[in-house]
């Protein structure tokens, strides 16, 4: 049925009184300025809100900050600006919130020009108290927490020094100078690039990649001629300048940089770039930019070593280095990713993969939608999703696509239905099966969020006019009910709910404007009384993910296994609850050739599932280097797709070949490696 507030589908009775009793307003008594909001910890209910206001004076800009804290999911806020001595906080550094439930917060303050160093405010008790610490350097970046130990902090200074603290920012030590980029790896390891001569920019392509595993006591140079590096899953990547020219190649390590292999990816020139789109412990999605200012490139997917790559998607939209791409991991269903391609006619189209980049297709047209003006055939068209690129182009798209791991199968996004993305005002669409089928959910642009692991979806209109109505659905977006949360409409700027979609609270943020003043205001609504009871076994039904044809014996098989989930029935109005854990049951599938990718030196001819040897390796770019040495590679031409769990069935056995590889990269052969100690 078409989206709307149909009387027939009013699931929740007498909700107005229940919600009215659970609606809390807070007016922030400062001028509008800008506002940033951070959640501190998981299930703590603690929110920090930082408002900043710039007053441009004749000579300089005077800044004023206010800090507010809530410990009840935003129902009430307390002004705690005095805890940070009424200091102006630098919003470009944001609020550095510690990992997991550490309760740690670091705020970076603005200090006057002549000071020796910067200033931070530190809290380790969920922002109940703050300690002021003056730094021996001026920070260039936000403080970075070690994922393993939240007491270990890392920062780069404006002078390119690498600073480390082992006691949550109390004491700092400069462990290296001339540092361009630094990142935490696993086990409190730090990776960083250094320049020898001029600067980061001047030495680009001549940087060295270093590693310290003991917070700066000792170092190991693990790469030279480095352009940049990145971490993804268990992979460490470095782009390395070639000897002969200005091109560079990707090298990959799975042992923290002790040994490297050259990735079987095209080299790129000065104006091009590589980008890790997504990575996990199994594999990597890598974007390789096309030559020239095309705005697109190619997506490649890796094998389990990060070495052999299969072409996944051509003409992948990615504007410039650090620019915009629509690549989105649909976290509510395994193997699903959505992105955009730039077609030959320069229109932008959405593509989806259900098998981790193996195949890409257009999104199925929603049953309750008509094809728009971009469609040549009014009966045949697709759904196209607005994501980062549309937002960057200032289209009327307030939010990127949304999915949550604990709201199985649900994807919500703005989109249009036609042959390509339309610049017309978009509508909101929902899929309840991870992107296979879609339904128009709401007319026009909205802010939306998922609560209670999918038990409730809430939305507010994105409008230039003030609003006072919130919409909610308890059946995965099929039917909507509306609640007037205030008599006096506000200019809404968004919705805020605790990350992880387990909360029952939603905050509507916005501002009120009167003749002389404008003030920030938030309305927090607790939906706990709408879902009066806890869900029981009878409230769930069994669902097979990735099902497309029940008559196919292997229906639902993706990457070698199928998964059945217990999903909340659409008719059940009950609480999944904070402790809800997705119940799923995997079953292994039989192997087919689809479960294998072609190994080094082999390829799949068009429309063929068999891997054939590249004819005498002629005309193929096979510069390939394993562990920095020339050596033999033995292969039978097939390699199981990373993360594939199939068993039995097809086992592609053929004689094992020895492929002589040529190692044309002089990137760090083992004898060049050196270690240093502080």
């Amino acid at each position: 049925s078409a989206p709307g507030e149909d009387e027939e589908c009013g699931r929740v009775r007498d909700f107005v009184a229940k919600l009215a009793n659970n609606t809390h307003q807070h007016v922030f008594d400062d001028l509008r300025g800008s506002v940033s909001l951070s959640w501190v910890g998981d299930s703590t209910g603690v929110i920090l809100v930082l408002t900043t206001f710039h007053v441009p004076l004749v000579i300089m800009t005077f800044g004023q900050s206010k800090l507010y804290r809530s410990e009840d999911y935003g129902k009430n806020f307390k002004d705690i600006t005095d805890l940070i001595n009424n200091t102006f906080i630098r919003t470009e550094f944001g609020m550095a919130i510690g990992p997991e439930n550490s309760g740690k917060v670091v705020l970076t303050a603005e200090v006057s020009g002549g000071s020796r160093g910067g200033r931070i405010f530190r809290s380790s008790d969920f922002a109940k108290n703050f300690v002021q610490t003056d730094l021996p350097f001026h920070p260039l970046t936000q403080m970075m927490y070690s994922p393993q130990n939240s007491d270990y902090l890392l920062a780069l200074s404006t002078e390119n020094g690498l600073w480390v603290s082992k006691n949550f920012g109390g004491k700092w030590e400069e462990i290296h100078k001339a540092v361009c980029l630094a990142k935490w790896g696993s086990d409190n390891t730090i990776f960083f690039t250094t320049y020898a001569n001029g600067s980061c920019k001047a030495d680009l392509g001549a940087l060295e990649l270093w590693r310290t595993s003991d917070l700066g006591k000792s170092f190991k140079t693990i790469g030279v001629k480095i352009y940049s590096f990145g971490l993804g899953g268990r992979f460490l990547f470095a782009s390395v300048m070639a000897d002969k020219d200005t091109t560079r190649r990707i090298h990959v390590s799975t042992d923290q940089g002790d040994t490297w292999s050259m990735a079987q990816l095209p080299s790129v020139g000065q104006e091009q770039f590589y980008s890790i789109l997504a990575a996990n412990d199994d594999m990597v999605f890598m974007h390789v930019d096309e030559p020239g200012d095309t705005g697109f490139g190619t997506i490649f997917t890796s094998d389990d070593r990060g070495i052999v790559y299969s072409k996944s998607l051509d003409r992948h939209l990615y504007t410039t280095t650090g620019g915009e791409t629509d690549f989105t991991n649909v976290t509510s269903l395994r193997g699903v990713y959505i992105t955009s391609v730039l077609s030959e006619d320069n229109s932008i189209q959405t593509m989806i993969t259900f098998d981790q980049g193996g195949r890409w297709t257009h999104l199925r047209k929603p049953e309750n939608s008509e094809c728009d003006a971009t469609a040549k055939n009014k009966n045949e068209c697709s759904l196209h999703i607005h994501a980062s690129y549309s937002i960057s182009q200032k289209l009327n798209v307030p939010m990127a696509p949304l999915s949550e791991p604990n709201a199985v199968g649900i994807v919500i996004a703005h989109g249009s239905v036609g042959d390509a993305i339309s610049v017309m005002v978009p509508d909101v669409y929902i899929s309840d099966d991870g992107g296979y089928s879609w339904t128009k959910m709401l007319e026009g642009p909205h802010y939306y969020t998922i609560l209670d692991s999918g038990g409730i979806i809430v939305a507010i209109e994105h409008s230039s006019r003030p609003i006072n109505v919130i919409k909610f659905s308890t059946d995965e977006g099929q039917c909507w009910q509306t609640y007037t949360f205030t008599r006096d409409p506000i200019y809404a700027t968004g919705l805020a709910s605790e990350p992880g979609a387990r909360s029952m609270n939603i905050s509507i943020w916005g501002f009120t404007e009167s003749f002389l003043t404008s003030q920030w205001v938030s309305y927090t609504i607790d939906f706990k009384d709408i879902l009066e009871r806890n869900c029981e076994e009878k409230d769930y039904t069994i669902w097979l993910a990735h099902s497309t044809d029940p008559e196919d014996y292997e229906d639902g098989c993706i990457l070698g296994y199928k998964e059945q989930f217990l999903r909340l029935r659409k008719s059940s109005v009950c609480q999944n609850g904070r402790d809800y854990v997705v119940t799923k049951q995997p079953s292994i599938c039989l192997c087919s050739l689809e479960d294998f990718l072609c190994d080094f030196g082999y390829y799949r001819p068009e429309n063929d599932s068999k891997c054939v040897e590249q004819p005498e390796l002629k005309g193929h770019d096979l510069e390939f280097c394993l562990y920095g040495r020339e050596e033999h590679l033995t292969t039978n031409g097939y390699r199981k797709i990373p993360g594939d769990k199939c068993q039995g069935g097809v086992n592609p056995v053929r004689e094992v070949k020895d492929l002589k590889k040529k190692c044309t990269s002089n990137f760090l052969s083992p004898e060049k490696q050196n270690s240093k100690s502080n």
Epitope: C479, T541, D552
Partner: antibody
């Protein structure tokens, strides 16, 4: 064409158990839920429960919880329904039926294939 | 569990008549409703699934409509073969059937 063939009629004493089988042929048994529905003489249809052969996930109507056990054997494409502590009110025709499926949901699309029914008579 | 109330319980009609049977759910079930036809001594036969989708092989004189809590099965022109008992069944909760509607010759 999919067919469901059920075991023959049974006469049982009160307090005993009955186990009815339902063998599928001509389709992918494992990918569909099998429901069990009964019909007492002159009465309407009553759903007892169902099972999904993959993983053996069974669920039961509240009324029969604890008294009915539904199982499936993928290797023989057979589903079973066992009803214990029989009483005279359990005298009925017992049907197995395949739940039609158009999406990943097993129970939402109606029962498109039915067995011929098994008459169970409970009498002392 | 969700209760299904079917009406009427008996309906007398003649060949060629337009017949409408109603089914009401105790709570909203979206479109998850099926209709069956059963003849004496036979297993039920699926006519309609998802409230309005016609099962393959079923004559087009049968149609279903409704969503939420109110549903109808319509036989546009009753044929001799259509005299039987009709059941609705909801699928968005533990499955429950309506009490049945017997369509008999007037």
């Amino acid at each position: 064409q999919v067919q469901l063939v059920q075991s023959g009629a049974e006469v049982k004493k009160p307090g005993s158990s009955v186990k009815v089988s339902c063998k599928a042929s001509g389709g992918t048994f494992r990918n569909y839920a099998i429901s069990w529905v009964r019909q007492a003489p002159g009465q309407g249809l009553e759903w007892m429960g169902g099972i999904i052969p993959i993983g053996g996930w069974a669920n039961y109507a509240q009324k029969f919880q604890g008294r009915v056990t539904i199982t499936a054997d993928e290797s023989t494409s057979t589903a079973y329904m066992e009803l214990s502590s029989l009483r005279s009110e359990d005298t009925a025709v017992y049907y197995c039926a395949r739940q039609g499926r158009k999406t990943g949901y097993y129970y939402y699309y109606g029962m498109d294939v039915w067995g011929q029914g098994t008459t169970v008579t409970v009498s002392s | 569990d969700i209760q299904m109330t079917q009406s009427p319980s008996t309906l007398s009609a003649s060949v060629g008549d337009r017949v409408t049977i109603t089914c009401r759910a105790s709570q909203s079930i979206s479109s998850w409703l099926a209709w069956y036809q059963q003849k004496p001594g036979k297993a039920p036969k699926l006519l309609i699934y998802k409230a309005s989708s016609l099962e393959s092989g079923v004559p087009s004189r049968f149609s279903g409509s409704g969503s939420g809590t109110e549903f109808t099965l319509t036989i546009s022109s009753l044929q001799p073969d259509d005299f039987a008992t009709y059941y609705c069944q909801q699928a968005d909760g533990h499955i429950t059937f309506g009490g049945g509607t017997k369509v008999e010759i007037k």
